[in-house]
């Protein structure tokens, strides 16, 4: 039976995809055949074949970036170290271990789902401008996050969510494979508006919130505060 596991990694970090026999297991390098590949596309990630130190069949995206330890293999640990994780690594990986002395019997089969995450930048909310006499427009920008974010606009007066019909979100996949988001909010002009833009990263359970206030008395200052709330908020930046 194939074991199933999940692991999470930040973009740019190193991650271990676990594939190991029970403690106390012992293997010989000249007896085990180990294959790591992606489950869907069957891309060759790395492998160990006795008496073959060449890894010429490894896909170029993983060469010198996906490695197993011979020392670990002797102890039944066929885990994969994936260095410098990228968003493109978010997929299912399959580890298969066979023993030659057991007639190429399957010793271990593990499927590891890798979830990749990256922190979005602290949102920047542009100063409001008036396309018309009775309307205000705010723009909120946040970049270099993963996975695709959710964007919410908040009425800071009572912390209520504004109607999503009032916002227009554009999400770009940038050159690094990370997401940039621009959200434009259009609301009716009122004497004093205190709103916030919230970028939610579901995988990291992280909300980044930035406030913007309009009125006769706008004293702008920056501050970043830790502000955990029920939505799992970890970092909040408030401008008021």
């Amino acid at each position: 039976d194939t074991q199933e596991k999940e692991v999470r990694a930040m973009v740019g970090s190193d991650v271990e995809l676990s594939c190991a026999c029970p403690e106390g297991s012992r293997f010989d390098l000249n007896d085990v055949y180990v294959y790591w590949q992606t489950s869907e596309s069957k891309t060759v990630v790395t492998y160990h074949i006795p008496q073959n130190s060449s890894l010429e069949n490894v896909d170029s995206r993983y060469r010198n970036r996906a490695l197993m330890s011979p020392a670990g293999m002797l102890r039944g640990d066929f885990s994969l170290r994936l260095f410098n994780v990228t968003p493109q690594d978010e997929q299912k990986f399959h580890c298969l271990v066979l023993s030659q002395s057991l007639g190429f019997q399957e010793v271990l089969s593990v499927e590891v789902t890798l979830h990749v995450a990256a922190n979005f930048s602290v949102p920047v909310v542009s100063a409001p401008h008036s396309p018309s006499q009775d309307e205000l427009t705010f723009t909120c920008t946040s970049i270099n996050g993963y996975p695709r974010p959710n964007v919410y606009w908040i009425n800071k007066t009572d912390n209520s969510l504004l109607d999503q019909a009032l916002q227009n979100d554009t999400v770009f996949l940038n050159m690094r494979g990370l997401y940039d988001v621009v959200s434009v909010l259009r609301i009716a002009r009122t004497p004093s508006v205190n709103i916030g833009c919230c970028i939610e990263n579901v995988l990291l359970q992280q909300n980044l919130t930035v406030g913007s206030q309009t009125g006769n008395d706008i004293g702008e200052r920056d501050k970043i505060t830790e502000n955990p709330v029920s939505t799992g908020e970890k970092n909040a930046a408030t401008w008021s």
Epitope: L29, N30, S69, P70, R75, D77, R81
Partner: antibody
Framework: QVQLVESGGGVVQPGRSLRLSCAAS????????MHWVRQAPGKGLEWVAV????????YYADSVEGRFTISRDNSKNTLYLQMNSLRAEDTAVFYC??????????????WGQGTLVTVSS | EIVLTQSPATLSLSPGERATLSCRAS??????LAWYQQKPGQAPRLLIY???NRATGIPARFSGSGSGTDFTLTISSLEPEDFAVYYC?????????FGQGTKVEIK
């Protein structure tokens, strides 16, 4: 050039403890697995312990399992070996050695000059 | 545990001569065998790994061959600095083990 310098050896009574250090320079310490290997006087070499490049995994020879602890401080480029419950048969020159590969192949490509540990009452 | 037996225990040769050192494993270690040189009062030095790959900076007169259980280290023409003890080591099985050494001395 790669340099490994061991320290902390000396004479110690059976049952007591000792901590060896190995200061590394001339290479990116945090990118290599590291080992301790020992050599009893006039005898051959015996592998003792290994630690992964990031300290995440450690393995030991059966003869020292449960008594010795290998560790590293990558910010200080230093490898350690904490030796407890020392026995007369632990008397040896202890070498720290660098593994050839980040993922620990069990090939020792650079060695320190060694530090002598004598366990005697 | 794999036992590595080196022969001869001592090899007496003159500078310029060819040295042939043997290492036999108690069971197959494939090609996962290394050779080290150790001079008196010094640390070992890696010469050959995975049976036949010369380590960085090792002169071409050192060569390794063999696979399975029988391995050979050859020094094609002995230089004065080559007189030392030579150890083989396997990494195919747990634990990693060394041979007892072959001493190459000046005849």
């Amino acid at each position: 050039q790669v340099q490994l310098v061991e320290s902390g050896g000396g004479v110690v009574q059976p049952g007591r403890s000792l901590r060896l250090s190995c200061a590394a320079s001339g290479f990116t310490f945090s990118s290599y697995g590291m080992h301790w290997v020992r050599q009893a006087p006039g005898k051959g070499l015996e592998w003792v312990a290994v630690i992964w490049y990031d300290g995440s995994k450690k393995y030991y020879a059966d003869s020292v399992e449960g008594r010795f602890t290998i560790s590293r401080d990558n910010s200080k480029n230093t490898l350690y070996l904490q030796m407890n419950s020392l026995r007369a048969e632990d008397t040896a020159v202890f070498y720290c050695a660098r593994d050839l590969n980040i993922m620990v192949w069990g090939i020792f490509d650079y060695w320190g000059q060694g530090t002598l540990v004598t366990v005697s009452s | 545990e794999i036992v590595l037996t080196q022969s001869p225990a001592t090899l007496s040769l003159s500078p310029g001569e060819r040295a042939t050192l043997s290492c036999r494993a108690s069971q197959s270690v494939s090609s996962y065998l290394a050779w080290y040189q150790q001079k008196p009062g010094q640390a070992p030095r890696l010469l050959i790994y995975d049976a036949s790959n010369r380590a960085t900076g090792i002169p071409a007169r050192f060569s390794g061959s063999g696979s399975g259980t029988d391995f050979t280290l050859t020094i094609s023409s002995l230089e004065p600095e080559d007189f030392a003890v030579y150890y083989c080591q396997q990494r195919n099985n747990w634990p990693w083990t060394f041979g007892q050494g072959t001493k190459v001395e000046i005849k």
